[in-house]
């Protein structure tokens, strides 16, 4: 399956925080989305192979890495002034 953690996270002002996303499905592609109240999902970053990733529609204030196939952590940087949202990770073949 695919596992995202933590379920809830509080960020102190000026801090970077990292959300974990791990999958054991042997999927090449992984995605991070953000959902704000009353809105649809918006793509932050996506990755289609190891060590390669592209910006989505709202990448500013976020960073990612894809060091291995199974993992695609998202860092919410201190530059992201409005981080409060629901974050969703997904994967596909």
């Amino acid at each position: 399956g695919i596992t995202q953690s933590p379920k809830y996270l509080f960020r102190k002002e000026g801090q970077n925080v990292t959300l974990s996303c791990e999958q054991n499905l042997n999927h090449d592609a992984m995605y991070w989305y953000r959902q704000d109240p009353g809105q649809g999902l918006r793509l932050i970053y996506y990755s289609q192979i190891v060590n390669d990733f592209q910006k989505g529609d709202i990448a500013e204030g976020y960073s990612v890495s894809r060091e291995k196939k199974e993992s695609f952590p998202l860092t919410v940087t201190s530059a992201q002034k409005n981080p409060t949202a629901f974050y969703l990770c997904a994967s596909s073949i």
Epitope: Q48, V50, N51, D52, F53, S65, R66, E67, K68, K69
Partner: antibody, heavy 120, light 112 residues
Framework: QVQLQESGPGLVKPSETLSLTCTVS?????????WNWIRQFPGKGLEWMGY???????NYNPSLKSRITISRDTSKNQFSLKLSSVTAADTAVYYC?????????????WGQGTTVTVSS | DIQMTQSPSSLSASVGDRVTITCRSS???????????LHWYQQKPGKAPKLLIY???NRFSGVPSRFSGSGSGTDFTLTISSLQPEDFATYYC?????????FGQGTKLEIK
């Protein structure tokens, strides 16, 4: 900052096995990425030989497949190249290398290179 | 294997010149994920190659803006807009879309 350093004999006899080791510092080879061997012939041509992945899986250049083995020693954070049945055509500068984060497979961490001469 | 053919093999130019090096692949370098893994390296004597451009047109960290890459499919170009003394070196294109990864034969850029 990832750093790589090759070590091994500079002279190998024809028909013997070439053995080189790459010691990696600044990053664990099991944490991610692909750990490559690339060689450069005296005429300056570059050839990708193969890699060992963070999970221990291999990908080799088919032109070398019957002769090449890339393995690793995770306790020493090293990966190694063995090339059997060498001839003078295997004389080259041998580099270990790994990709830079976020560049696909584009390599930008290189060892300093070690010159291997095949001669009796 | 994908053959990578660079032209010219050598080139003489002066400081301040605009220089273009071309690289042609024997097959399309568009990956099934729609990215194109074509890269450019610079090598100076006795040193390992250095990454300049990755994925056709992305300048690597610390690479001056006078270096640019373009192209698609099978035809690619490295352009140096205004040559500086430190740019005289050998340049290689490389593809990592298809295994085995392959390199061009190199273009030696010399001072006129």
């Amino acid at each position: 900052q990832v750093q790589l350093q090759e070590s091994g004999p500079g002279l190998v006899k024809p028909s013997e096995t070439l053995s080189l080791t790459c010691t990696v510092s600044g990053y664990s080879i099991t944490s991610g990425y692909f750990w490559n061997w690339i060689r450069q012939f005296p005429g300056k041509g570059l050839e990708w030989m193969g890699y060992i992945s963070y999970d221990g899986s291999n990908n080799y250049n088919p032109s070398l497949k019957s002769r090449i083995t890339i393995s690793r020693d995770t306790s020493k954070n090293q990966f190694s190249l063995k090339l059997s049945s060498v001839t003078a055509a295997d004389t080259a500068v041998y580099y270990c290398a790994s990709p830079s984060p976020g560049t696909g497979y584009a390599v930008d961490y290189w060892g300093q290179g070690t010159t291997v001469t095949v001669s009796s | 294997d994908i053959q990578m053919t660079q032209s010219p093999s050598s080139l003489s130019a002066s400081v301040g010149d605009r220089v273009t090096i071309t690289c042609r692949s024997s097959q399309s370098l568009v990956h099934s994920n729609r990215n194109t893994y074509l890269h450019w390296y610079q090598q100076k004597p006795g040193k390992a190659p250095k990454l300049l451009i990755y994925k056709v047109s992305n300048r690597f960290s610390g690479v001056p803006s006078r270096f640019s890459g373009s192209g698609s499919g099978t035809d690619f170009t490295l352009t140096i807009s205004s040559l500086q003394p430190e740019d005289f070196a050998t340049y290689y294109c490389s593809q990592s879309t298809h295994v085995p990864f392959t390199f061009g034969q190199g273009t030696k850029l010399e001072i006129k």
